[in-house]
Interface confidence: low
């Protein structure tokens, strides 16, 4: 069938269109093109005779048409009037006629649009704005863009006039944006330049900064005011209702208590005509004096005296604060505060109460601190210590003993031998001692301020013969693979060699054995059950030697994995079942049995007479060592066969 295709269908003014013929018949005489939907001689555009290849213009020929041998028609420099239908009339050689009609539409190239507005300075929450996209163009579609986005859905936005007009009702400051319109038709699309909507708003309620309202006398007051506004607000300051100045900032140097009052910032928008104010109340406080501490007892005696510390000066309606060692007061029954917190009482002072103590006066602005105060607590003397710790000396050496006792003020020392006063010194020195220097050596410490005295007595033995040593231990029952044990050979003697034996042998080389303290101490790390041996220490000097009695180490261990005997697991029905459980353990463990998970009895031996197949199952022995806190277990399966069915063993 003969058809006409328009390429393109929508044609821009000034461009060209091709009316393309499809299914053109064979053996043609010629063809003609007509404007319109039918053959009308008055509207013939062009005719073509194939035999002569002659094209003849018709009444509707405009000079812009070109006909091709394949019957297609090209129209150039398209104008608006070219829109419509075109008919091709084909005359075949047998003079039979055929017709086909095609069409196209002509659209203008759109100009760049622009936006007109009915209100260039709308007021927030009051005015509406209507934007119109110019020019008005037939067969054009109008689109709108806000900040290069399509229009948001909003009841305040309304399109009218075929979308050519965009109306914003009750504008807000958030409508301040870039607006563009776009025109479209089938052959072109153009977008306008941006129009920025300038919404007048504010002023909002101003904010005054900084936020603080309390100041000290002598400081500078510097207040700044800001209110959201378009155009920017004009500012005025009022103090206690009296106009001060028309500035955004208010600065008053070196303020006094008289500058306390209400400070008002007024913001004014000259375009909207609106005013808004904010008031802040400023309080200026006088500078308080620096506090100091007085004490009712500058030299209190430990465990006897109380001390009352008072924060000066006394000021009405003031909060007093206390600190000890830069910390707030600890909770203690020995610390008492007066009702107004001005007096801190320390009941029964100790040497640890020296301080430092600080008091503070809290005012509306800050805390003012006193200088720290330190208490001179009188204490001691504590029990004196005599060094060195040796108690055995050989004749001919020098004896030099020193005494020390904690005390404030420092203690005065005296030495007595067998109750007889010797000298008033901290150190006692006797050269070239003999057996006659053996005896009771007493150090007496005296505190002259408190009047207290304390003594310590030490027995000194001067002998060529060493005493029989003994072994002390820091752990009498160590646990295997867990504890360490330190043996110490007593006494500590001067110029003495210390020796050790284990089971009568000298010490084996082992990373778990360590000698220290001049070989006087033997440490066993990570003890094992094999360390349960006899330990002996010996002492010797150039004239004598002696050994201690043996000390046997009692190592707690286990329980190890238990063993159930006999090892048999198959029995004949009717036999007696007699199972015995054993686990290596010190002390001996506690035993218990479970059959198929059910607890049975707390014995080492489990006996069941005349067993049957019902006694089949798992037999578990549990062992526990209360001393080591460790547990262990083993499970054995027992099978009981009916008599004669399998070779069994009878218990």
């Amino acid at each position: 069938k003969l058809t006409i295709e328009s390429t393109p269908f929508n044609v821009a003014e000034g461009k060209e269109v091709l009316l393309l013929v499809h299914n053109l018949p064979q053996h043609l005489f010629g063809y003609s093109w007509y404007k319109g939907e039918r053959v009308d001689g008055n509207r013939q555009i062009i005719g073509y005779v194939i035999g002569t290849q002659q094209a003849t213009p018709g009444p509707a020929y405009s000079g812009r048409e070109i006909i091709y041998p394949n019957a297609s028609l090209l129209i150039q420099n398209i104008i608006q009037n070219d829109t419509g239908f075109y008919t091709l009339h084909v005359i075949k050689s047998d003079l039979v006629n055929e017709e086909a009609t095609g069409q196209f539409r002509v659209y203008p190239e759109l100009p760049k649009p622009s936006i007109s507005s009915n209100n260039s300075k709308p007021v927030e929450d009051k005015d509406a704005v209507a934007f119109t996209c110019e020019p008005e163009t037939q067969d054009a579609t109008y689109l709108w863009w806000v900040n290069n986005q399509s229009l948001p859905v909003s009841p305040r936005l309304q399109l009218s006039n075929g979308n050519r007009t965009l109306t914003l009702f009750n504008v807000t400051r958030n409508d301040t944006a870039s607006y563009k319109c776009e025109t479209q038709n089938p052959v072109s699309a153009r977008r306008s330049d941006s129009v920025i909507l300038n919404v007048l708003y504010g002023p909002d309620a101003p904010t005054i900064s900084p936020l603080n309202t309390s100041y000290r006398s002598g400081e500078n007051l510097n207040l700044s005011c800001h209110a959201a506004s378009n155009p920017p607000a004009q500012y005025s300051w009022f103090v206690n209702g009296t106009f001060q100045q028309s500035t955004q900032e208010l600065f008053i140097p070196n303020i006094t208590v008289n500058n306390s009052g209400s400070y008002t910032c007024q913001a004014h928008n000259s375009d909207t005509g609106l005013n808004r104010t904010t008031v802040t109340t400023i309080t200026v406080y006088a500078e308080p004096p620096k506090p100091f501490i007085t004490s009712n007892n500058s030299n209190p005696v430990e465990d006897e005296d109380a001390v009352a510390l008072t924060c000066e000066p006394e000021i009405q309606n003031t909060t007093y604060l206390w600190w000890v060692n830069n910390q707030s007061l600890p909770v203690s029954p020995r610390l008492q505060l007066s009702n107004d917190n001005r007096t801190l009482t320390l009941l029964s002072v100790t040497r640890n109460d020296v301080g430092p103590y600080e008091c503070g006066i809290q005012n509306e602005l800050s805390v003012d601190h006193s200088d720290p105060v330190i208490l001179n607590v009188l204490y001691g003397p504590d029990d004196p210590t005599i060094s060195p710790s040796y108690t055995y000396y050989r004749p001919g050496v020098n004896l030099s003993l020193s005494c020390h006792a904690a005390s404030n003020p420092p203690a005065q020392y005296s030495w007595l031998i067998d109750g007889n006063i010797q000298q008033h010194t901290q150190e006692l020195f006797i050269s070239n001692i003999t057996e006659k220097n053996s005896g009771l050596y007493t150090c007496q410490a005296n505190n002259s301020a408190s009047g207290h005295s304390r003594t310590t007595v030490k027995t000194i033995t001067v002998s060529a013969e060493l005493p029989k040593p003994s072994i002390s231990s820091n752990n009498s029952k160590p646990v295997e693979d867990k504890d360490a044990v330190a043996f110490t050979c007593e006494p500590e003697a001067q110029n003495t060699t210390y020796l050790w034996w284990v089971n009568g042998q000298s010490l084996p080389v082992s990373p778990r054995l360590q000698l220290s303290n001049g070989n006087r101490t033997l440490t066993l790390f990570n003890v094992t059950r094999n360390d349960a041996r006899a330990y002996v220490c010996g002492i010797q000097n150039s004239v004598s030697a002696n050994r201690s009695d043996p000390v046997t180490l009692d190592v707690l261990y286990g329980p190890d994995t238990p063993i159930i005997s006999p090892p048999d697991s198959s029995y004949l029905s009717g036999a007696n079942l007699n199972l015995s459980c054993h686990s290596a353990s010190n002390p001996s463990p506690q035993y218990s049995w479970r059959i198929n998970g059910i607890p049975q009895q707390h014995t080492q031996v489990l006996f069941i007479a005349k067993i049957t197949p019902n006694n089949n199952g798992t037999y578990a022995c549990f062992v526990s060592n209360l001393a080591t806190g460790r547990n262990n277990s083993i499970v054995k399966s027992i099978t009981v066969s009916a008599s004669g069915t399998s070779p069994g063993l009878s218990a």
Epitope: S214, Y215, E219, W323, E364, L365, V367, P372
Partner: nanobody, 117 residues
Framework: QVQLVESGGGLVQPGGSLRLSCAAS????????MSWVRQAPGKGLEWVSG????????RYADSVKGRFTISRDNAKNTLYLQMNSLKSEDTALYYC??????????WGQGTLVTVSS
């Protein structure tokens, strides 16, 4: 004319450290109780720490105790704030101020501390 100039702020990762300084002039620094205060984005002012005139006594807000250390050098008229183990909630504009506790006197323009990974 009282002048306080803070410095030392910046961007730091959580757990990091910063040391803020405040150079003071125009008043008797050595006889003024000094404080650090801060203002987090969208929040009000928060007192951070205070120090007495000779530096012998310091106080801290619970939120920074054990992490921040305030100190001063009266010879240099300078206040310091050593900030360790910083957290994201420490992000704020930090001001040094004359006074402390419930109110403050003049303060500087602030230094911004941003704690972010």
């Amino acid at each position: 004319q009282v002048q306080l100039v803070e410095s030392g702020g910046g961007l730091v990762q959580p757990g990091g450290s910063l040391r803020l300084s405040c150079a003071a002039s125009g008043f008797t620094f050595s006889s003024s109780y000094m404080s650090w205060v801060r203002q987090a984005p969208g929040k009000g002012l928060e007192w951070v720490s205070g120090i007495n005139t000779d530096g012998s006594f310091t106080r801290y807000a619970d939120s920074v105790k054990g992490r921040f250390t305030i100190s001063r050098d009266n010879a240099k008229n300078t206040l310091y704030l050593q900030m360790n183990s910083l957290k994201s909630e420490d992000t704020a504009l930090y001001y040094c101020a004359v006074g402390g506790g419930l109110g403050y006197g003049p303060w500087g323009q602030g230094t911004l501390v941003t704690v972010s990974s």
